[in-house]
């Protein structure tokens, strides 16, 4: 058993039918010595008396808010949560496996630049009685500070018969060094509590591996005289790290016909302009990627040819 | 050329070669991003590689103030990786494919290090750790880790030279 926060405790259980469970001793936080009784949740049934209460925790019915009283007055509370371990595997019932970029990916994170700011998100089908708390650090043995905000519900989607809820959190490395080569990964730890079930999820990454620039901005077409060619120009996204002479991007320019089956013409360039042939009803799209490190491409910025 | 005393390197040549190094490092092991090598416990393997750290002056301001600190650190790293790529980690079993870009990568590391430090000038170089994996699968894993680490190193070096070529070239 360990303390998650004040008056909230997590009992780790080997989880199988008829498992013996864990013996837990609760102590009433009071100078009083006698006349103390204990109850669980809203029930008025007295579970025991005395300053300590010994219970065998086996199932969710044994978890909950234990309260010690004296003469009708509440003295203190202890909330017991369960963390299930089945066959050596901690339960992951609360969050959905996003399966990208690999199986058992519960947390996904992205950064728009090298400033040390990043966003993580996760999915669940649970709509109520759900709380998250997020901690992060750079490295684990001698951790350096990363500050995370509160996790918030950022999207709701319908997937078949189920509703899916997306939560996200923003974090900022306290002393970020954008130009340095990272040697210690960022660690992100999410505590999830659904009713009386506790679970924890972790992710470990370098900022360089989760970089995904915003799409190029101010995408414009300039027709070239007496030609089907156009000059496409764009700018670095505002959110990208500066100076651009140091934090450089490379770009992919694509001409795509109306039909998805039509052949796509692609040009790669380090410049912020390119000359392409604009076909009727086609659109021109540009996306960006770090020039020197193959992290994710941005989403496309697009304009119609006509 | 970067003389330890302080004259400027051939920024544009260094920029071109470092950008080529980036391309080669990713073509040598493009799928490395899909392997979570940190799960494989790399404490003893890639902890000793020289990283370009915050105080090494490789940020735009540091380069403007005095690029020598940063260039020395980059030079150290280039020599270190050049030695690693020439060691039995890469020459031993399982053999690299004949068209593997590792050979080109090795030569380009040497080329860039020579651009930074002509013969007769000596910067301190870092000791290469004695890594001699016994099993072929351990050697393969170590190659992945070294190339992964090299990708990050050359990305910073390429940024330095690109910025230098754009802002510090005479």
């Amino acid at each position: 058993i360990w303390e998650l926060k004040k008056d909230v405790y997590v009992v780790e259980l080997d989880w199988y039918p008829d498992a013996p469970g864990e013996m837990v001793v609760l102590t009433c936080d009071t100078p009083e010595e006698d006349g103390i009784t204990w109850t669980l949740d809203q029930s008025s049934e007295v579970l025991g008396s005395g300053k300590t209460l010994t219970i065998q925790v086996k199932e969710f019915g044994d978890a909950g808010q234990y309260t010690c009283h004296k003469g009708g007055e509440v003295l203190s509370h202890s909330l017991l949560l369960l963390h299930k371990k089945e066959d050596g595997i901690w339960s992951t019932d609360i969050l959905k496996d996003q399966k990208e970029p690999k199986n058992k990916t519960f947390l996904r994170c992205e950064a728009k630049n090298y400033s040390g700011r990043f966003t993580c998100w996760w999915l669940t089908t649970i709509s109520t009685d759900l709380t998250f708390s997020v901690k992060s650090s750079r490295g684990s043995s001698d951790p350096q500070g990363v500050t995370c905000g509160a996790a918030t519900l950022s999207a709701e989607r319908v997937r078949g018969d189920n509703k899916e809820y997306e939560y996200s959190v923003e974090c900022q490395e306290d002393s970020a060094c954008p130009a340095a080569e990272e040697s210690l990964p960022i660690e992100v730890m999410v505590d999830a509590v659904h009713k009386l079930k506790y679970e924890n999820y972790t992710s470990s990454f370098f900022i360089r591996d989760i970089i995904k620039p915003d799409p190029p901005k101010n995408l414009q077409l300039k027709p070239l005289k007496n030609s089907r060619q156009v000059e496409v120009s764009w700018e670095y996204p505002d959110t990208w790290s500066t100076p651009h002479s140091y934090f450089s991007l490379t770009f992919c320019v694509q001409v795509q016909g109306k039909s998805k089956r039509e052949k796509k013409d692609r040009v790669f360039t380090d410049k912020t302009s390119a000359t392409v042939i604009c076909r009727k009803n086609a659109s021109i799209s540009v996306r960006a990627q770090d020039r020197y490190y193959s992290s994710s491409w941005s989403e496309w910025a697009s304009v119609p040819c006509s | 050329r970067a003389v330890p005393g302080g004259s400027s390197p051939a920024w544009t040549q260094c920029q071109q070669l470092s950008q080529k190094l980036c391309t080669l490092a990713w073509s040598a092991h493009p799928l490395v991003g899909h392997m979570d090598l940190r799960e494989e416990g790399d404490e003893e393997t890639t902890n000793d590689v020289p990283h370009i750290q915050c105080g090494d002056g490789c940020d735009p301001q540091g380069l403007r103030d005095n690029s020598q600190f940063c260039l020395q650190r980059i030079h150290q790293g280039l020599i270190f990786y050049e030695k690693l790529l020439g060691s039995d980690i890469f020459t031993g079993e399982p053999s690299l494919l004949p068209d593997s870009p590792v050979g080109q990568l090795h030569a380009s590391l040497l080329g860039l290090s020579q651009l930074l430090q002509p013969e007769g000038h000596h910067w301190e170089t870092q000791q290469i750790p004695s890594l001699s994996p016994s099993q072929p699968w351990q050697r393969l894993l170590l190659r992945f880790k070294i190339l992964r680490s090299l990708q990050a190193f050359v990305a910073v070096a390429a940024r330095v030279f690109a910025h230098g070529a754009a802002t510090l070239s005479p």
Epitope: W15, Y16, P17, D18, E59, F60, E86, D87, G88, I89, S91, T92, D93, K96, D97, T125 | -
Partner: antibody
Framework: EVQLLESGGGLVQPGGSLRLSCAAS????????MSWVRQAPGKGLEWVSS????????DYADSVKGRFTISRDNSKNTLYLQMNSLRAEDTAVYYC?????????WGQGTLVTVSS | DIQMTQSPGTLSLSPGERATVSCRAS???????LAWYQQKPGLAPRLLIY???NRATGIPDRFSGSGSGTDFTLTITRLEPEDFAVYYC?????????FGPGTKVDIK
């Protein structure tokens, strides 16, 4: 007392389908992961598939991936194994068991014979 | 996948004797996630040991498990008549969870 009772086995032609069921009692079924393990006649044990308590995560042996689907109905305390594109080598006694991998409680098994 | 091998294939012993069954994994079994099962003809298997050395509920103390990494052992200190059966080891550190081929302990 924990009890697991498999049903749905029988003779099926190669390429055919079969759906096995496992009725659970004596424990809070919806709180626990469940598995299927099989045993070919005169041979050893082979783990086939597992499903977590909520049904949100499933795992399969390579030999059945893409052909077999494990599922559960917590309201009926029942575990299922839908077997499609059956092959002769799928002939075995199929056991349902509690747990992701460590089978602490087992059913008595149901025999599946794949033959033309 | 982790391959499991067991030795010997058959062990012929008399009641009261000590039985030692070995199980070897093709790669390290993390956290000693290894189980042992007993199976008698016509019956479902029964869990004996989990986490390499923990006895399952109701298993007599003559059964013990040991080992870590790639090498594991099941020991029955004094064979009782009801102990003559087939014994399987199983790793559950990595999916797919694989069983050994079994060791038959029969009466000499």
């Amino acid at each position: 007392e924990v009890q697991l009772l498999e049903s749905g086995g029988g003779l099926v032609q190669p390429g055919g389908s079969l759906r096995l069921s496992c009725a659970a009692s004596g424990f809070t079924f919806s709180n626990y992961s469940m598995s299927w393990v099989r045993q070919a006649p005169g041979k050893g044990l082979e783990w086939v598939s597992s499903i977590r308590s909520s049904g949100g995560r499933t795992d399969y042996a390579d030999s059945v991936k893409g052909r077999f689907t494990i599922s559960r109905d917590n309201s009926k305390n029942t575990l299922y194994l839908q077997m499609n594109s059956l092959r002769a080598e799928d002939t075995a006694v199929y056991y349902c068991a509690t747990g992701i991998a460590v089978a602490r409680y087992w059913g008595q098994g149901t025999l599946v014979t794949v033959s033309s | 996948d982790i391959q499991m091998t067991q030795s010997p294939g058959t062990l012929s012993l008399s009641p009261g004797e000590r039985a030692t069954v070995s199980c070897r994994a093709s790669q390290s079994v993390s956290s000693s996630y290894l189980a042992w099962y007993q199976q008698k003809p016509g019956l479902a298997p029964r869990l004996l040991i989990y986490d390499a050395s923990n006895r399952a509920t109701g298993i007599p103390d003559r059964f013990s498990g040991s080992g870590s990494g790639t090498d594991f052992t099941l020991t029955i200190t004094r064979l009782e008549p009801e102990d003559f059966a087939v014994y399987y080891c199983q790793q559950y550190s990595t999916s797919p969870f694989t069983f050994g081929p079994g060791t038959k302990v029969d009466i000499k």
